[in-house]
Amino acid sequence: ARNGDHCPLGPGRCCRLHTVRASLEDLGWADWVLSPREVQVTMCIGACPSQFRAANMHAQIKTSLHRLKPDTVPAPCCVPASYNPMVLIQKTDTGVSLQTYDDLLAKDCHCI
Amino acid sequence: ARNGDHCPLGPGRCCRLHTVRASLEDLGWADWVLSPREVQVTMCIGACPSQFRAANMHAQIKTSLHRLKPDTVPAPCCVPASYNPMVLIQKTDTGVSLQTYDDLLAKDCHCI
């Protein structure tokens, strides 16, 4: 159950997709990736207030227990709900190869 | 790629399965659930230091970018990798029903 998309903390403060530009050096990939040289990394960032984009029943439970025991139970966390693939040109034992990574770029976010 | 399970912060400090006892009242379920009266909620709690239980490539990227831009990119977060089902006896319009929830109790944890 994907709950409300209205952010009570103000526009852009809650869990959503952000884009962060990163070089191969930033990612620690310079020694094994040839291309792309720079990646527009899409990731999920933001707060998860009560029932905001709750991914499932577990997220709803977590919200309830966090309200009761904030020192014990953390609030739900903003994580990818799905991913976009990304193709890298990478070095291999025999030379160079195209490789698709299915879990690299966040496509959609939820709270869990 | 599920990375290292050694916690550099000390035993029990990193992302792992915890059990939190909760009543129907705690969960806000008292008006629609009859049984169980108390739930041993298994959830994922703990820190996600560099490459600890990294769920996938995205988690590895997040770790790298958090190190570079800690104010912009949060550290990976401890969330369920899989769930155990749970059966509730719940009230319905016509009486009482058994209902299985597949996404209620965390079974295994990782960082993402």
């Epitope: 990304m86 040109i89 291999t92 034992d93 030379g95 190869s97 195209l98 | -």
Partner: antibody
Framework: EVQLLESGGGLVQPGGSLRLSCAVS????????MTWVRQAPGKGLEWIGI???????YYASWAKGRFTISKDSSKNTVYLQMNSLRAEDTAVYFC???????????????WGQGTLVTVSS | DIVMTQSPATLSVSPGERATLSCQAS??????LAWFQQKPGQPPRLLIY???TLASGIPARFSGSGSGTEFTLTISSLQSEDFAVYYC????????????FGQGTKVEIK
């Protein structure tokens, strides 16, 4: 010795299908990407697509849907399945080792001699 | 879709002269570019890969430069065997991967 040999070309009617083969020797298909390229008579080269060592496929936008690249590593053969063929698909079809824009270790220029496909009624 | 545009379509050069061929990519392809030489009835021959690296067995009079969207192949002193058609190939990768050749530049004797 490392070799690539295309086969399966010939005359086919418009709307028909054809499967080209590229038999390789001297290396393992699980370790190398393979590219298909075509060239219409008197025209330029056209990139069709790639199959990676791990089996992922990538296509030119015009080839998606009609052309399918596959391989059988046990037979050391890469295939190009072509469906709904048109007159403009008439060309010499080449297979080549690697992604071409970067060199693999060893021989940098491994191409087959090509096989001619003629689409005509 | 990635589009590679070569210029000029034909280049008339005298033996011993310098030839400069251009290739432009519609997307930023970093150094994902190769140059090929082709003569009638033969498969293409790799000259330059990674935009500027000379392939094995290729004479040093061939050189490549550029990155991103603008690339150049230079033949410093044309020999008789260099008169042929030259193609650039670019590969763009992001959410998928796609390659494209330029339309070719014919280098002919002036």
């Amino acid at each position: 010795e490392v070799q690539l040999l295309e086969s399966g070309g010939g005359l086919v009617q418009p709307g028909g299908s054809l499967r080209l083969s590229c038999a390789v020797s001297g290396f393992s298909l699980s370790s190398y990407d393979m590219t298909w390229v075509r060239q219409a008579p008197g025209k330029g080269l056209e990139w069709i697509g790639i199959i990676s060592g791990s089996g992922n496929t990538y296509y030119a936008s015009w080839a998606k849907g009609r052309f399918t690249i596959s391989k059988d590593s046990s037979k050391n053969t890469v295939y190009l399945q072509m469906n709904s063929l048109r007159a403009e698909d008439t060309a010499v079809y080449f297979c080549a080792r690697g992604i071409l824009v970067y060199a693999d270790y060893g021989d940098h220029n491994l191409w087959g001699q090509g096989t001619l496909v003629t689409v005509s009624s | 879709d990635i589009v590679m545009t070569q210029s000029p379509a034909t280049l008339s050069v005298s033996p011993g002269e310098r030839a400069t061929l251009s290739c432009q990519a519609s997307e930023d392809i970093y150094t994902n570019l190769a140059w090929f030489q082709q003569k009638p009835g033969q498969p293409p021959r790799l000259l330059i890969y990674a935009a500027s690296t000379l392939a094995s067995g290729i004479p040093a009079r061939f050189s490549g430069s550029g990155s991103g969207t603008e690339f150049t192949l230079t033949i410093s002193s044309l020999q008789s065997e260099d008169f042929a058609v030259y193609y650039c190939l670019g590969v763009y990768t992001y959410i998928s991967a796609e390659g494209a050749f330029g339309q070719g530049t014919k280098v002919e004797i002036k």
